[in-house]
């Protein structure tokens, strides 16, 4: 079988949801010594980077200027060491937001509920769209989808304190083109004393994989680079939204 290098890891810097006309940055984390990185969009070559000197960095950043619906979609990357190419990375879905209109998000029975109550979010957008998306702050990869003509509902079932947090919704014109975000709705879930102390809370930190972790080579890194990279690929689970 034809020998290939381990696949790189592709990430969006800061977020995979990019407002239209803003610049997106994608990172391709490959290997020290890679002489070329290629970014592919929907299966076609998009951009090329040849780091100099190649042995000093384990990846590159690609920019995508002036984000619009033509540049929203599935990206992947590959890299080359000498004449040997890597496997293709997982696919990264890049979404353009702030298209057209702004939906309205509401919650029933209200933003302050007790643990165990059933809660439903409603997202409304009067312009032509059939798919709606609900995201929780700090959990932007965990997108819930719902369908409706001008409004969609997101039944949460009986909630726990783990549901606490800030929510926004989007209308979607296709899988990769979303509306402006709604104003956030903060859900406050109170529980009894014993439950609250044991209940997992949901801190609103940014998604850990929406960060570019490129490093410059020092000391032992050179010897460990390939092993480390293989281990990262083994443990890295790419989340499709």
């Amino acid at each position: 079988p034809k020998q290939t290098l381990p696949k790189p890891i592709i990430r969006a810097e800061s977020t995979y949801m990019v407002p239209k006309e803003k610049q997106a940055t994608l990172c391709c984390q490959g290997s020290y010594g890679a002489v070329e990185y290629q970014l592919h969009f929907e299966g076609s070559l998009f951009a090329v980077e040849r780091p100099k000197p190649p042995e000093r960095i384990n990846g590159v950043k690609f920019h995508i200027p002036d984000m619009n619906s033509r540049k929203a979609g599935r990206y992947s990357c590959i890299y080359r060491v000498g004449e040997l190419w890597s496997e293709r990375s997982d696919l990264l879905d890049l979404v353009v937001t702030e298209m057209y209109d702004t939906p309205t998000l509401s919650v029933h029975p209200g933003p302050e509920v007790t643990s165990g109550e059933k809660v439903t979010f409603y997202c409304r957008l009067d312009t032509a769209t059939s798919m709606f998306l609900l995201l929780k702050e700090g959990r932007s990869r965990d997108v819930q989808r719902s369908y409706g003509k001008v409004q969609a509902e997101f039944p949460m079932g009986p909630v726990t304190t783990a549901h606490r947090g800030s929510y926004r919704c989007f209308g979607s014109y296709n899988n990769y083109a979303w509306s402006f975000p709604s104003e956030p709705v903060k859900l406050l879930v109170t529980g009894d004393i014993e439950n609250t102390s044991l209940a997992p809370t949901d801190p609103t930190f940014p998604d850990s994989w929406d960060t570019c972790l490129l490093t410059r080579e020092t000391g032992l890194q050179k010897d460990l680079a390939l092993w480390d990279h293989t281990a990262q690929n083994h443990h890295h689970h790419h989340h499709h939204h």
Epitope: A47, H63, D66
Partner: nanobody
Framework: QVQLVESGGGLVQPGGSLRLACAAS????????MGWFRQAPGKEREFVAA????????YYADSVKGRFTISRDNAKNTVYLQMNSLKPEDTAVYYC????????????????????WGQGTLVTVSS
């Protein structure tokens, strides 16, 4: 913002040579990666060649590799496309494009990567 103006197009016989130039306005030319694209009648615009902002990285379409050379002179705010061994299938309007990448060594291959475009110059290869 940068304005781009192409020149150097014209009629040339098969096997002949032409040098296209693309002059850019503004003082920040050296911060832009540059590319050449072409569009033949009735066809889609296609990538020809690209050069990084410091000139250290070049990339070519397979169809022109070994015949075309892209270069730049940052002091003159100009990017060039030297076209040798021209063929009838090279007939097209040639466009210059510019974009600001994150590094000195990055180039774009897709038209969507580029932010600014010239109006184009016509190259006709015919006997």
């Amino acid at each position: 913002q940068v304005q781009l103006v192409e020149s150097g197009g014209g009629l040339v016989q098969p096997g002949g040579s032409l040098r296209l130039a693309c002059a850019a306005s503004g003082r920040t030319f050296s911060t832009y990666a540059m590319g050449w694209f072409r569009q033949a009648p009735g066809k889609e615009r296609e990538f020809v060649a690209a050069i990084s902002r410091n000139g250290g990285t070049t990339y070519y379409a397979d169809s022109v590799k070994g015949r075309f050379t892209i270069s730049r002179d940052n002091a003159k705010n100009t990017v060039y496309l030297q076209m040798n061994s021209l063929k009838p299938e090279d007939t097209a309007v040639y466009y210059c494009a510019a974009s600001r990448p994150l590094s000195n060594t990055q180039v774009g291959v897709a038209s969507a990567w580029y932010e600014f475009w010239g109006q184009g110059t016509l190259v006709t290869v015919s006997s």
